[in-house]
Amino acid sequence: LYFSRDAYWEKLYVDQAAGTPLLYVHALRDAPEEVPSFRLGQHLYGTYRTRLHENNWICIQEDTGLLYLNRSLDHSSWEKLSVRNRGFPLLTVYLKVFLSPTSLREGECQWPGCARVYFSFFNTSFPACSSLKPRELCFPETRPSFRIRENRPPGTFHQFRLLPVQFLCPNISVAYRLLEGEGLPFRCAPDSLEVSTRWALDREQREKYELVAVCTVHAGAREEVVMVPFPVTVYDEDDSAPTFPAGVDTASAVVEFKRKEDTVVATLRVFDADVVPASGELVRRYTSTLLPGDTWAQQTFRVEHWPNETSVQANGSFVRATVHDYRLVLNRNLSISENRTMQLAVLVNDSDFQGPGAGVLLLHFNVSVLPVSLHLPSTYSLSVSRRARRFAQIGKVCVENCQAFSGINVQYKLHSSGANCSTLGVVTSAEDTSGILFVNDTKALRRPKCAELHYMVVATDQQTSRQAQAQLLVTVEGSYVAEEAGCPLSCAVSKRRLECEECGGLGSPTGRCEWRQGDGKGITRNFSTCSPSTKTCPDGHCDVVETQDINICPQDCLRGSIVGGHEPGEPRGIKAGYGTCNCFPEEEKCFCEPEDIQDPLCDELCR
């Protein structure tokens, strides 16, 4: 048995006569042989579920579900209840109605075995019938909505009449009907005004019925029509077995460059026309088990269940359904030497499904784990300016497919052919498993015998110690020119183009800072600034070389304060700035200010 609504509403007036009928509550059957029996909770409740008083005023007919006044609710009774309402004005009280067979404790009131009946209290007597508007004569203030379980025996779930109005205003004639399309499973009995289902409903065919209730009021010669929505929601039960969309029960996958723990290797989709169990229960009741195979597979893979609600078309309307994605996921980082092929089976069980048929499916994953060989190009050739400053980025080294790697930890090292010409350093970038080559020793750059720098690049997989090697030849170009006196260590200090371009700074490949002219569009990512190399700084990312010294690119790397119009970077630096941004790394400060219209040079010329 279950209630067709979880809440009912009616009005209560002071001194309403004992015996006044208030409303009917309705229960629907889960099985044909069930007979409902109603009982009221012992207490009346007020605002914020405050228990006000034992219910001495309202009774229920156990077999019919009719609620009526057992005794009149006078002013003194009302005040007694109001005092207990934690100081709030008492505008609404509610009662709990239980279906007798269910032994729910008074404290809990959960649909389907319990419903709440709310009474709006009016501190006046019942109004004169002639003063009631048609809307008040026809329907309660709060529009009802109904819930009916699918596949259950048909039954009565609503009664249209407002019983106090019918009781106190017998001369007003009120008629009801349901507007509904052809073939809908509802009927409104013209005599009793009871609404019932004609047959058991199937949610997978239709989930929502947006009916309209029409009320016609006859008062003397006057006839008025009132229409209100009459929504019915069909509640789901687990009556559909899981299936494979388009019959696809097998997924094949190759694990090669993406070897990181939590990588999704393959996905298989299961469709279920049901939307139960509900999300809270779903993973517990809709189980997936990786069937025992070899231990390696059990340790290496796991299956993740990702249910999602979807909607499908049925008989011209959309109904909800569930798609279950079963993802085969790496449980650990896989070594580059792993080389296996296996078939994994996953048992999916819709444990609430009662049949006919089985609620069990078998998913198949064919997985090939390929080994990864580390290869470097045979030779790298680069050039570097003799004027390059320390931390200038001059190139990248990268094992074959390194951009595609994840879960593979490759470290790069440089072996210089001689210590006196050991100019470059290499750091491994976590983002793309490449090695960034940078100037580490500017003194060596200036030695005449170091016109050509010979290195061996050694790439080592940290897990297996497998290596790849390549020769790196760096040609040193240009001649060294000493820097202007008084230039700052960081390019970012310069606020104007002129002073920017006549100095060098840490990270500058040419020995000169570069000016980046912004687009001038308010707070923008493309703000004006002075940089060691606009290729790498600022780019919204504090790279592995820039982390070596805050003076290289404070625009990307500063953790200090930024003054002026800006958007901070995540987790550091300036994501966007207003006008020109310059920085003072030692003070851990950056300033973003409107561009100066006049250059000092212009001032001189104007004089």
Epitope: S378, T379, S417, A419, N420, H454
Partner: antibody
């Protein structure tokens, strides 16, 4: 003047490990350059085996990599070669040599003949 | 690996002759080729590196030329002490590889 002298057993049994040492005088192996092992089978050409860098890093010829280990003893200014699971094909004169700034081999030892035979 | 092919494998010449040995690489090695002299009972000697750079202490009668794949060692006037085996070696690409040698004998 840099001098390199190879030493080690002249006869090694098949499947055993060949071990040679190169003693360097006149230059510290931790100061600079790469320190190499090269071999020459009787009547054949030269084959580079691998090196140990002044920093301690190593690099090996891929064709021998699975069997080779080059290490050093800085206190004695020596570097060593170990070649495991030897066969008759590993019979050769083994040279140690110092690399140049362009990877060419500027200084060589006299070489030592190692015969693999039971 | 880069294959190095020397020719001829041996040659006979007289003192004072001009001798040319060629070395061909299986792919371009830029200018990075070294030449060595090997004599029995003596340590091998680096003559030329980077194609044409004469090492200190090496007589000027030795010269190297070429780039890409084709290289030449020339001894302008053969001396008695030059009778030996000569090897080329590419030092452009890992792993470094040698030619099979050219033996220069007395005619």
């Amino acid at each position: 003047e840099v001098q390199l002298v190879e030493s080690g057993p002249g006869l090694v049994k098949p499947s055993e490990t060949l071990s040679l040492t190169c003693t360097v005088s006149g230059y510290s192996i931790t100061s600079d350059y790469v320190w190499n092992w090269i071999r020459q089978p009787p009547g054949k050409g030269l084959e580079w085996i691998g090196y140990i860098h002044y920093s301690g890093g190593t690099s090996y010829n891929p064709s021998l990599k699975s069997r080779v280990t080059i290490s050093r003893d800085t206190s004695k200014n020596q570097f060593s070669l170990k070649l495991s699971s030897v066969t008759a094909a590993d019979t050769a004169v083994y040279y140690c040599a110092r690399g140049n700034y362009d990877w060419a081999f500027a200084y060589w030892g006299q070489g030592t003949l190692v015969t693999v035979s039971s | 690996d880069i294959q190095m092919t020397q020719s001829p494998s041996s040659l006979s010449a007289s003192v004072g002759d001009r001798v040319t040995i060629t070395c061909r690489a299986s792919k371009s090695i830029s200018k990075y080729l070294a030449w060595y002299q090997q004599k029995p009972g003596k340590a091998n000697k680096l003559l030329i590196s980077s194609g044409s750079t004469l090492q200190s202490g090496v007589p000027s009668r030795f010269s190297g030329s070429g780039s890409g794949t084709d290289f030449t060692l020339t001894i302008s006037s053969l001396q008695p002490e030059d009778f030996a085996t000569y090897y080329c070696q590419q030092h452009n690409e890992y792993p470094w590889t040698f030619g099979q040698g050219t033996k220069v004998e007395i005619k």
